[in-house]
């Protein structure tokens, strides 16, 4: 008896520009001979239902379609017929087939790749044709994917220590493409200093499904205004 | 920066069973197999075996055959040697050693090795 | 089992000479047009390191003096210029067949 065992869950999420392994394991009654095997993988695109072949191994040959890609002849002797596919592509997305022929069973599996990039955060002040004692706090999120992406504004203040979402005068942009297919949105915070506690802390938060955890970055505001820190964490998707 | 971190020093009586760990850091520890070679006093290197962390896929020397079995922790990037019934000619140092497998096959990163002594 | 016989076992060379050896295995360690042949150095009281992958790349951070060459079943370590520090024993190893096996070492001395 032949069979092929995908990824559980039959989606792979692996960051952009990543060396993915996308598994395959083979489960044969006998010890596996690689020189009296195939392995093809084959991937079909989100936009477009064609399937188009990516690797190919038999006996004593292995061909690339898509460059970089191979499956590990000493990995295949144990049962393990996963493609490595080296700095993996937003466009590389979709379904990917194991096909396992072990003359004459032939056995397969489907796996769907979703491949993921992480947004950069930055905070920003920008006073131009703002009143007095009125700031306009920006944070810009660049270079992610998917576009859904969740930006909310935060403050923690020495009266309630724990963070308080905002909600008024916070206006976020629309998301716009970059040309390598990734998006960047800006979220604005409008803020009264006269209105604020100095030592307020002010987050700009980001949800997106290639973190963890939320990036966050934030500022406190100072008898003289306003103090920006530095993004303080970065946990992106690995 | 990749580190393999051997198990101390075993000293074990015949017909004993000895477990070597290697505890790997500064890579993704399913991307690569983990050999593992010996050395007896004096003598060359020995191929006893790797694992496939990625499916705990494992091939043995045939001598060892039934004697050894490799093992690996993914959760704790620790891989294991275990060798039952052993003999004095065992006596040896045992070195796990990160082996590429995609671009060729080799091992680019070796532990310090673990001196397991057989004596009565 | 793939036997890989290295020539000489012993060899004693002045700084700044150049150094040869040979490996020669019982059968071709060629597969799909590469060569799975390994070279290692293993220094007195350490662990073997990894010199040269594939017959002939230099694997990262070994000086160049050290070069591969060969394919089937005839391969070659040459060193250019050998330094103190390149004292040790040195081991081939193919990995095209298992169990994988090693040649039986050269050992390197400075004259």
């Known amino acids: 008896d032949l069979k092929v065992e995908m990824m559980a869950g039959g989606t792979q999420i692996t960051p952009l520009n990543d060396n993915v392994t996308i598994f395959c394991n083979i489960f044969y009654s006998q010890p596996l001979n690689i020189t009296s095997m195939g392995i093809t993988w084959f991937w079909k695109s989100l936009t477009f239902d064609k399937e188009v072949k990516v690797f190919e191994f038999f006996g004593d040959h292995q061909e690339a379609f898509r460059p970089g890609a191979i499956v590990s002849p000493w990995r295949l002797k144990s049962g393990d017929a996963s493609l490595r596919l080296p700095g993996i592509q937003l466009e590389e997305a979709g379904e990917y087939r194991c096909e396992v022929v072990v003359t004459p069973l032939k056995a397969q599996g489907t796996v769907q790749l979703e491949v993921v990039a992480s947004p950069a955060s930055r905070l920003l002040l920008d006073q131009v044709g703002m009143k007095e004692n009125e700031d306009k706090y920006m944070c810009e999120s660049s270079g992610f994917y998917p576009e859904a992406i969740n930006i909310t504004w935060e403050k923690q203040t020495q009266k309630f220590p724990h963070p308080i979402e905002i909600s008024e005068d916070v206006i976020t942009g629309p998301t716009i493409k970059n040309m390598d297919g990734t998006f960047n949105v800006t979220s604005c915070l409008k803020l009264n200093s006269s209105q604020e506690d100095p030592g307020t802390v002010y987050q700009c938060v980001v949800r997106h499904a290639s973190l963890h955890t939320p990036l966050r970055s934030n500022f406190t505001l100072t008898a003289a205004r306003h103090s920006l820190s530095e993004t303080e964490k970065t946990d992106n998707f690995s | 920066e990749v580190q393999l971190v051997q198990s101390g020093a075993e000293v074990k009586k015949p017909g004993a069973s000895v477990k070597v760990s290697c505890k790997a850091s500064?890579?993704?520890?399913?991307?690569?197999?983990m050999d593992w070679v010996r050395q007896a006093p004096g003598q060359g290197l020995e191929w006893i075996g790797d694992i496939n962390p990625n499916n705990g896929g494992t091939l043995y020397n045939q001598k060892f055959r039934g004697r050894v079995t490799l093992t690996v922790d993914t959760s704790i990037s620790t891989a294991y040697m275990e060798l039952s019934r052993l003999r004095s000619d065992d006596t040896a140092v045992y070195y796990c050693?990160?082996?590429?497998?995609?671009?060729?096959?080799?091992?680019?990163?070796w532990g310090q090795g673990t001196t397991v002594t057989v004596s009565s | 089992d793939i036997v890989l016989t290295q020539t000489p076992l012993s060899l004693s060379v002045t700084p700044g000479q150049p150094a040869s050896i040979s490996c020669k295995a019982s059968q071709s360690v060629d597969y799909d047009g590469d060569s799975y042949m390994n070279w290692y150095l293993q220094k007195p009281g350490q662990p073997p390191q990894l010199l040269i992958y594939a017959a002939s790349t230099l694997h990262s951070g070994i000086p160049d003096r050290f070069s591969g060459s060969g394919s089937g079943t005839d391969f070659t370590l040459k060193i250019s210029r050998v330094e103190a520090e390149d004292v040790g024993v040195y081991y081939c190893?193919?990995?095209?067949?298992?169990?994988?096996?090693f040649g039986q070492g050269t050992k390197l001395e400075i004259k």
């Open positions: 190893q193919q990995s095209k067949e298992d169990p994988r096996t």
């Open positions: 500064g890579y993704t520890f399913t991307d690569y197999n």
């Open positions: 050693a990160r082996s590429e497998v995609f671009y060729g096959n080799y091992a680019d990163y």
